[in-house]
C-alpha cells in the first residue's frame, strides 16, 4: 500500500522535534529499540507510543522542565504538544490496544526520537518506492 498520511505526519512531527533540543529532551526514556529483533512493526509503533505517553504523563508538570519564565513554559508546552501528537499518530499506525514495555535499557528522549525518525523514514522510503 502507498504511504499512509499518518506516516507522513509522524515524520513531519519528528523532523520538528529533532530540529532543536531542550533541557527535557535530555531526560531518559525506556529504550525499546535496544532489543527489538523479534518485534513486529505494529508492536514497535505501539511500544514507542507507550514510551512517549509515559514520558509526557510523567513530565508534563515537571518543574525542571517548566522552568522559571513564560518563555521556558512555552517551550515545554511545545514539547508536550508535539509528543502528544506523535503518540496519537503512532497509536493510529499501530492499531493495537496495548503493548508491554519491559526493557531495562534507557536512552535520552532526544536519541529515542532520532532513532524513531530513522525507522519511520526507512518505512516511508519502502512504501513510496
Amino acid at each position: 500500500h502507498k504511504c499512509d498520511i499518518t506516516l507522513q505526519e509522524i515524520i513531519k512531527t519528528l523532523n520538528s522535534l529533532t530540529e532543536q533540543k531542550t533541557l527535557c529532551t535530555e531526560l531518559t526514556v525506556t529504550d525499546i529499540f535496544a532489543a527489538s529483533k523479534n518485534t513486529t512493526e505494529k508492536e514497535t509503533f505501539c511500544r514507542a507510543a507507550t514510551v512517549l505517553r509515559q514520558f509526557y504523563s510523567h513530565h508534563e508538570k515537571d518543574t525542571r522542565c517548566l522552568g522559571a519564565t513564560a518563555q521556558q513554559f512555552h517551550r515545554h508546552k511545545q514539547l508536550i504538544r508535539f509528543l502528544k501528537r506523535l503518540d496519537r499518530n503512532l497509536w493510529g499506525l499501530a492499531g493495537l490496544n496495548s503493548c508491554p514495555v519491559k526493557e531495562a535499557n534507557q536512552s535520552t528522549l532526544e536519541n529515542f526520537l532520532e532513532r524513531l525518525k530513522t525507522i519511520m523514514r526507512e518505512k516511508y522510503s519502502k512504501c513510496s518506492s
Epitope: 520538528s16 532543536q20 533540543k21
Partner: antibody, heavy 118, light 107 residues
Framework: EVQLVESGGGLVQPGGSLRLSCAAS????????MHWVRQAPGKGLEWVVW????????TYADDFKGRFTISRDNSKNTLYLQMNSLRAEDTAVYYC???????????WGQGTLVTVSS | EIVLTQSPATLSLSPGERATLSCKAS??????AAWYQQKPGQAPRLLIY???HRYTGIPARFSGSGSGTDFTLTISSLEPEDFAVYYC?????????FGQGTKVEIK
C-alpha cells in the same frame, strides 16, 4: 521549503499608520510562534513582538505596547503588524521570523523597509 | 529588561584565524542564549541556540559556550564567507533582547 515573505512597507508620514504582512509557507503555521524584529539603518537588531500562533497570545517589548499590534490569520498562514502613531525613529527594515520549535528564530523573511518621513 | 553587551565591537582577522566573540548579560539567562550571523543586505541567520547547540546545517567551525551571564561564540578557522556581523540574543525571558553586534572584518 520554509518561506516567509513580508510586504506592506513604504513611505509614511509621522503620525501615520501602516500594516505589514508576512506570508508563511512550507510548514504548519500554527506549530511555530512568529516574531517581528526591526533594524534601523546601520544599526543592530531590535525585537518587537512575538505571537503564539495557536492561541493568538502576543508578547510585546515595552516600547511597542499600545502603538503596535501583532495578529495572524491562520486560514491564510499570514502574520500582520499594525503600526500606528509612527515616528521618524520607527524607520527600519522590519523582519518577520519564525520562532524555532523551542529556541531562537530559525527562519527569517527578506525584510520590508518602513520609512517615516515628512 | 536584560541588556546584552557584546565585545569587541569590531574584530579584524585574516582567513584561517580563530575568532572569539563575547556576550555578557546584565543578569543570568541560564543557557537561553543564541547567536546569529548577518551579512550586508541579508536577513540574520541562526547559528547557535541554547548556548552551545549548532542549528541544522551550520558548519562545525562555529561553536558556542558559556552559561549564566557570560557567553562566547568561537569560529575555529575563519572562512571568507564568515566575515559578517554577529549578534547574541537571549530568549530566557521577554522582552527578547539582542546584543549590539560584533563585526568580524578582514584584516
Amino acid at each position: 521549503e520554509v518561506q516567509l515573505v513580508e510586504s506592506g512597507g513604504g513611505l509614511v508620514q509621522p503620525g501615520g499608520s501602516l500594516r505589514l504582512s508576512c506570508a508563511a509557507s512550507g510548514y504548519t503555521f500554527t506549530d511555530y510562534s512568529m516574531h517581528w524584529v526591526r533594524q534601523a539603518p546601520g544599526k543592530g537588531l531590535e525585537w518587537v513582538v512575538w505571537i503564539n500562533t495557536e492561541t493568538g497570545e502576543p508578547t510585546y517589548a515595552d516600547d511597542f505596547k499600545g502603538r503596535f499590534t501583532i495578529s495572524r490569520d491562520n486560514s491564510k498562514n499570514t502574520l500582520y503588524l499594525q503600526m500606528n502613531s509612527l515616528r521618524a525613529e520607527d524607520t527600519a527594515v522590519y523582519y518577520c521570523a519564525r520562532g524555532g520549535i523551542f529556541y531562537g528564530m530559525d527562519y527569517w523573511g527578506q525584510g520590508t523597509l518602513v520609512t517615516v518621513s515628512s | 529588561e536584560i541588556v546584552l553587551t557584546q565585545s569587541p565591537a569590531t574584530l579584524s582577522l585574516s582567513p584561517g584565524e580563530r575568532a572569539t566573540l563575547s556576550c555578557k548579560a546584565s543578569q543570568s539567562v541560564i543557557n537561553d542564549a543564541a547567536w546569529y550571523q548577518q551579512k550586508p543586505g541579508q536577513a540574520p541567520r541562526l547559528l547557535i541556540y541554547y548556548t552551545s547547540h549548532r542549528y541544522t546545517g551550520i558548519p562545525a567551525r562555529f561553536s558556542g559556550s558559556g552559561s549564566g551571564t557570560d557567553f562566547t561564540l568561537t569560529i575555529s578557522s575563519l572562512e571568507p564567507e564568515d566575515f559578517a556581523v554577529y549578534y547574541c540574543q537571549q530568549d530566557y525571558t521577554s522582552p527578547w533582547t539582542f546584543g549590539q553586534g560584533t563585526k568580524v572584518e578582514i584584516k
